[in-house]
Interface confidence: low
């Protein structure tokens, strides 16, 4: 069937339109175009005879039409009057005629719109504003934008006049925004420039800052006032009802008790004519006395005495506060406060209770601190320590031992050998020792104030032969890439060389291996699984040597990224799927499987008999090592094909 298609259907003035003919019959004599829905000689635009390829203009020809051999008609420089129907009359060679009608619409290119307003400075909660989109244009649609968003749903927003007018009832400060209007027709869309709505509002109730209402005599008073307002508010200050100044800030230096009273800030908006006030009551306090601490025991004995600290002076209706080490009092059954908090009692003092202690008197405004007080707690002596820690010495060297015990006042020291008193000094020195100097060396520490004494005994061996050493470790199960391990060769011996072997080889050069403490300590930083070897230490001097038993390092590692085998990812329907997962790990990891994210079983092997295309998906193996706290996983895609096809295995 003969049809006419208009391209485009909606045409802008000045543009062109093509009336495209479809299903043109064969064996044509010619054709003719008419304006309107029927063949009317008075409204003929153009005729065309195929044999002569001759086009003949008709009465309705405007000079803007071009007819093509395929009967299509192009109309250029479209005007408004071109809107409507167009009829094609086709004359076939057998003189049987056919007709078809098409149509298009013409619309003007819209001008850029603008916004007019009936009120440029509306007052909040009082005025309405009507925006109108200019100019008024026929067959145009009007749209509105607020801050480049479409209009919000609000009972205060009303569209009228075919959406050309936007009315905001009872404007608020939140209506201060960018407004745009847009005109649209089927061939164009234009948006106006922004119009900013300037809503007059306020002043709101002013706020006075800072909020602080209590001051100390001698301080400066600096109050600031602010009220939300458009245009900005004008401010006035009143003290006890008396006008002070017309500023936003009020400053009074070096205030006294006489400056106590009510302070009023008044905010005024000259455009809205509104006033709002806020009142704050300021209280100025006199300076209180500085407190100090008294103690009932200036030299208490550790674990025996109690100490009562009292905050002076005593003032009625006053709050007393305490601090220890610049912190508020810790919760402790050994700390007790009196009912008025003025006395702090320390029950059974310890050496850690030295302080410093401070007390404070709190008035309405601030807290005044005392000077700090430190307790002289008598303690000790603790068990003395004898240094150096060597227990083996070679004959002929000098023996020099030193003793120390924590004590207040400092301890007095005595030395005994095999129970016999030697001397009353902190250090014991014996030159050119022999095997006869072997024995029990005792240090006794005495506190003259508490009368307490403590002793420590050390066995000293003088011998040319070295003992069999042993290895101690600070970490028996280090985690790979995380922990360090320190091996120490025991015992500590004087004038002795320490040696180390790993798997029977001398130490390799490595930035992760470090010798210290006279080569007596071997530290492995950031251990790896390759460090799980046998370590041996040796000691030697000029007359003997000895080796320790080996110590094997048990490094926890993994799990590494698992490997799923076999590597095949394509299977035929009906086959058995047997996937095995393996991950290097110490200790052995726990395994679990997920298919398409759904947990399956906690085994190393996943077996599914007689798989089908329903078993397509992602197969994930998860491994976790409870000792290292680490996890790992790998995902494999499995494709199952119907039995008739033979897919190639993918890598």
């Amino acid at each position: 069937k003969l049809t006419i298609e208009s391209t485009p259907f909606n045409v802008a003035e000045g543009k062109e339109v093509l009336l495209l003919v479809h299903n043109l019959p064969q064996h044509l004599f010619g054709y003719s175009w008419y304006k309107g829905e029927r063949v009317d000689g008075n409204r003929q635009i153009i005729g065309y005879v195929i044999g002569t390829q001759q086009a003949t203009p008709g009465p309705a020809y405007s000079g803007r039409e071009i007819i093509y051999p395929n009967a299509s008609l192009l109309i250029q420089n479209i005007i408004q009057n071109d809107t409507g129907f167009y009829t094609l009359h086709v004359i076939k060679s057998d003189l049987v005629n056919e007709e078809a009608t098409g149509q298009f619409r013409v619309y003007p290119e819209l001008p850029k719109p603008s916004i007019s307003s009936n009120n440029s400075k509306p007052v909040e909660d009082k005025d309405a504003v009507a925006f109108t989109c200019e100019p008024e244009t026929q067959d145009a649609t009007y749209l509105w934008w607020v801050n480049n968003q479409s209009l919000p749903v609000s009972p205060r927003l009303q569209l009228s006049n075919g959406n050309r007018t936007l009315t905001l009832f009872n404007v608020t400060r939140n209506d201060t925004a960018s407004y745009k209007c847009e005109t649209q027709n089927p061939v164009s869309a234009r948006r106006s420039d922004s119009v900013i709505l300037n809503v007059l509002y306020g002043p709101d109730a002013p706020t006075i800052s800072p909020l602080n209402t209590s001051y100390r005599s001698g301080e400066n008073l600096n109050l600031s006032c602010h009220a939300a307002s458009n245009p900005p508010a004008q401010y006035s200050w009143f003290v006890n009802g008396t006008f002070q100044q017309s500023t936003q800030e009020l400053f009074i230096p070096n205030i006294t008790v006489n400056n106590s009273g009510s302070y009023t800030c008044q905010a005024h908006n000259s455009d809205t004519g509104l006033n709002r006030t806020t009142v704050t009551t300021i209280t100025v306090y006199a300076e209180p006395p500085k407190p100090f601490i008294t103690s009932n025991n200036s030299n208490p004995v550790e674990d025996e005495d109690a100490v009562a600290l009292t905050c002076e002076p005593e003032i009625q209706n006053t709050t007393y506060l305490w601090w220890v080490n610049n912190q508020s009092l810790p919760v402790s059954p050994r700390l007790q406060l009196s009912n008025d908090n003025r006395t702090l009692t320390l029950l059974s003092v310890t050496r850690n209770d030295v302080g410093p202690y401070e007390c404070g008197i709190q008035n309405e405004l601030s807290v005044d601190h005392s000077d700090p007080v430190i307790l002289n707690v008598l303690y000790g002596p603790d068990d003395p320590t004898i240094s150096p820690s060597y227990t083996y010495y070679r004959p002929g060297v000098n023996l020099s031992l030193s003793c120390h015990a924590a004590s207040n006042p400092p301890a007095q020291y005595s030395w005994l050998i095999d129970g016999n008193i030697q001397q009353h000094t902190q250090e014991l020195f014996i030159s050119n020792i022999t095997e006869k100097n072997s024995g029990l060396y005792t240090c006794q520490a005495n506190n003259s104030a508490s009368g307490h004494s403590r002793t420590t005994v050390k066995t000293i061996t003088v011998s040319a032969e070295l003992p069999k050493p042993s290895i101690s470790s600070n970490n028996s199960k280090p985690v790979e890439d995380k922990d360090a391990v320190a091996f120490t060769c025991e015992p500590e011996a004087q004038n002795t060389t320490y040696l180390w072997w790993v798997n029977g080889q001398s130490l390799p050069v490595s930035p992760r291996l470090q010798l210290s403490n006279g080569n007596r300590t071997l530290t492995l930083f950031n251990v790896t699984r390759n460090d799980a070897r046998a370590y041996v230490c040796g000691i030697q001097n000029s007359v003997s040597a000895n080796r320790s038993d080996p110590v094997t390092l048990d490094v926890l590692y993994g799990p590494d990224t698992p490997i799923i085998s076999p590597p095949d990812s394509s299977y035929l329907s009906g086959a058995n799927l047997n996937l095995s997962c393996h991950s290097a790990s110490n200790p052995s990891p726990q395994y679990s499987w997920r298919i398409n994210g759904i947990p399956q079983q906690h085994t190393q092997v996943l077996f599914i008999a007689k798989i089908t295309p329903n078993n397509n998906g992602t197969y994930a193996c998860f491994v976790s090592n409870l000792a290292t706290g680490r996890n790992n996983s790998i995902v494999k895609s499995i494709t199952v094909s119907a039995s008739g096809t033979s897919p190639g295995l993918s890598a």
Partner: antibody, heavy 117, light 111 residues
Framework: EVQLVQSGAEVKKPGASVKVSCKAS????????MNWVRQAPGQRLEWMGD????????SYNQNFKGRVTITRDTSASTAYMELSSLRSEDTAVYYC??????????WGQGTLVTVSS | EIVMTQSPATLSVSPGERATLSCRAS??????????IHWYQQKPGQAPRLLIY???NLETGIPARFSGSGSGTEFTLTISSLQSEDFAVYYC?????????FGGGTKVEIK
């Protein structure tokens, strides 16, 4: 922050080979597959292949008929792509891309390879 | 291999307008409920940047005006309100089967 830094631009003659490197940082190199994608002028992006840095396993686009080889050096956290038997149509920007969430999550800055006689 | 077809080749849009880009796969790229299709943005002289993964998941740091939808073989990338920095070429990628393949791209240009 994940970063992939590629080697500089190369000019090669037809028949020669080119090897582009991609150094990774900001994540564990062996945990994620590394892919290579190229983009010839005016053409769509074309996936060339990938490597699992942990075990060295590779997959390739058969359109390259065995001309592409992808390798890695885990100690240097670096992946390499070598393309042999170069022809003029191999002129392209070559990208490395880290594989995550079933897609190319992070890309290198690209390396321009020009093949010209 | 799976052939990815994007349309239109060029899309002219004004800033603030909505843009809708299409991507069609020659066969299904879904597997067990997951759509293995991803969208990338590329600007001149830069590497592609991942916007959407698994058809509809927004990559970290990508603005919410980008969204993806679709399943099976038909997928759509939508930019709700185009910003100046969004004018670029957009590619879809399928990772359902090796070789992974990209669409020919849609260039989004300023109208």
């Amino acid at each position: 922050e994940v970063q992939l830094v590629q080697s500089g631009a190369e000019v090669k003659k037809p028949g020669a080979s080119v090897k582009v490197s991609c150094k990774a940082s900001g994540y564990t190199f062996t945990d994620y597959h590394m892919n290579w994608v190229r983009q010839a002028p005016g053409q769509r992006l074309e996936w060339m292949g990938d490597i699992n840095p942990d075990i060295g396993g590779t997959s390739y686009n058969q359109n390259f008929k065995g001309r592409v080889t992808i390798t890695r050096d885990t100690s240097a956290s670096t992946a390499y792509m070598e393309l042999s038997s170069l022809r003029s149509e191999d002129t392209a920007v070559y990208y490395c891309a880290r594989w995550d969430f079933d897609s190319f999550a992070n890309w290198g800055q690209g390396t321009l390879v020009t093949v010209s006689s | 291999e799976i052939v990815m077809t994007q349309s239109p080749a060029t899309l002219s849009v004004s800033p603030g307008e909505r843009a809708t880009l299409s991507c069609r796969a020659s066969e299904s790229v879904s597997i067990i409920g997951t759509n293995l299709i991803h969208w990338y943005q590329q600007k001149p002289g830069q590497a592609p940047r991942l916007l959407i993964y698994h058809a509809s998941n927004l990559e970290t740091g990508i603005p919410a005006r980008f969204s993806g939808s679709g399943s099976g073989t038909e997928f759509t990338l939508t930019i709700s309100s185009l910003q100046s920095e969004d004018f670029a070429v957009y590619y879809c990628l399928q990772s359902r089967k090796i070789p992974y393949t990209f669409g020919g791209g849609t260039k989004v240009e300023i109208k």
